[in-house]
């Protein structure tokens, strides 16, 4: 079974979260995708979404969030720039497929943003404050407002044991180590 993992990214204020979610190219290439935050006990809240239909490698900016859907590669790129401590939380990518419920993508992202700015340029890739130049023509896409009760999610279990969900053949695994992007070893 595929494992739905949670990756932890630890960044400083002012830095950029730069992640990707992959999807089945043949099924979802032009589907509308969204970036959501999941707060304990609440419905996932959509923060930004691509256009409908999603345009290939066309950046969409909503505040400090930039989405770029490479549907010739089956990848949604998500950037959150100029991170703030209050951005800390659990995030996920989903694909809207009305009237069906949103389809959740791998992986969930546990973002931890801390105060202060570590290091000088050259000490760590994270220490660079990338200034992303987004064309002024980028659009703010309208996101569907509906949410489904089945998209309400619980925090991952404290143990490292897999929690089986037979209907979807997905296991939820608690990943406890921290990623200080990029991690290659």
């Amino acid at each position: 079974a595929t494992k739905l993992t949670e990756e932890k990214y630890e960044l400083k204020e002012g830095q950029t979260l730069d992640v990707k979610c992959d999807y089945t190219l043949e099924k979802f290439a032009s589907s509308q995708k969204a970036w959501q935050i999941i707060r304990d006990g609440e419905m996932p809240k959509t923060l930004a979404c691509t256009e409908r239909p999603s345009k290939n490698s066309h950046p969409v900016q909503v505040g400090r969030i930039i989405l770029e859907d490479y549907h010739d590669h089956g990848l949604l790129r998500v950037r959150m720039v100029n991170l703030q401590v209050e951005d800390s939380g659990l995030y996920q990518c989903v694909i809207y497929q009305p009237p069906k419920e949103p389809h959740m993508l791998f992986d969930r992202i546990r973002l931890v943003v801390t105060k202060g700015f570590s290091g000088t340029p050259g000490s760590n890739e994270n220490s660079t404050q990338n200034v992303y130049k987004i064309p002024p023509t980028t659009t703010k896409a309208l996101c569907p407002l509906y949410t489904s009760p089945r998209t309400v999610t619980q925090a991952p279990p404290k143990s490292t044991a897999d929690v089986s969900t037979p209907d979807s053949e997905i296991n939820l695994t608690n990943v406890t180590d921290i990623i200080r992007v990029p991690v290659f070893n």
């Epitope: 993992t5 590669h73 791998f106």
Partner: antibody, heavy 122, light 107 residues
């Protein structure tokens, strides 16, 4: 130690297919993308595409689309790249390379297979 | 696609020399650039990622700098074992693209 070991050299005819394997060891296989890069003799490096061994999803460069298929077998921590409708200009060394954590946009290839020479000749 | 132009395509230098290779992107790629070393008959090896971060275990004589469209790779004191071809690679946009390579030889 962390390594990628590829299958041996192949000689094949135009129009045929070739399937190259890449066995990963020494790390959590499902956590890192595997990429494929090829290099014709005396030429530069050309990225072909990527695969997420956890989800099984993959993507490839436009020029290979429809000809390349990437699959994996998680039980034996192996990724496969099949290239079909081979032409003489597909003659090259094919490398698998580990990318970053699957959720990260940081595409640096830190571990490489030894390469598989594929010769397409009639 | 983003084009990566490396120069020179080849160079010859003496042991101990400072060697500089440049890589120019056809558009702004922020700091999303990696450098690789490839010795004859071998697979490439990652040296630098994120424009200037040295990969673990790579000697400190190798360094990288730059941001935007212009990047530089430097070997501060060329050693005999540095004979290889060096490639830059961008990852700001898909598809990922490599420079044409710079072949470094010893005089």
């Amino acid at each position: 130690q962390v390594q990628l070991v590829q299958s041996g050299a192949e000689v094949t005819k135009p129009g045929a297919s070739v399937k190259v394997s890449c066995k990963a060891s020494g790390y959590t296989f499902t956590r890192y993308d595997i990429n494929w890069v090829r290099q014709a003799t005396g030429q530069g490096l050309e990225w072909m595409g990527w695969m997420n061994p956890n989800s099984g999803n993959s993507g490839s460069v436009q020029k290979f689309r429809g000809r390349v298929t990437m699959t994996r077998n998680t039980s034996i921590t192996t990724v496969y790249m099949e290239l079909s409708s081979l032409r003489s200009d597909d003659t090259a060394v094919y490398y698998c390379a580990r990318g970053g954590i699957s959720s990260s946009w940081h595409w640096a290839f830190d571990i490489w297979g030894q390469g598989t020479m594929v010769t397409v000749s009639s | 696609d983003i084009q990566m132009t490396q120069s020179p395509s080849s160079l010859s230098a003496s042991v101990g020399d400072r060697v500089t290779i440049t890589c120019q992107a056809s558009q702004d790629i922020n700091n999303h650039l990696n450098w690789y070393q490839q010795k004859p008959g071998k697979a490439p090896k990652l040296l630098i990622y994120g424009a200037y971060t040295l990969e673990t275990g790579v000697p400190s004589r190798f360094s990288g700098s730059g941001s935007g469209t212009d990047f530089t790779f430097t070997i501060s004191s060329l050693q005999p074992e540095d004979i290889a071809t060096y490639y830059c690679q961008q990852y700001d946009k898909l598809p990922l693209t490599f420079g044409g390579g710079t072949k470094v030889e010893i005089k």
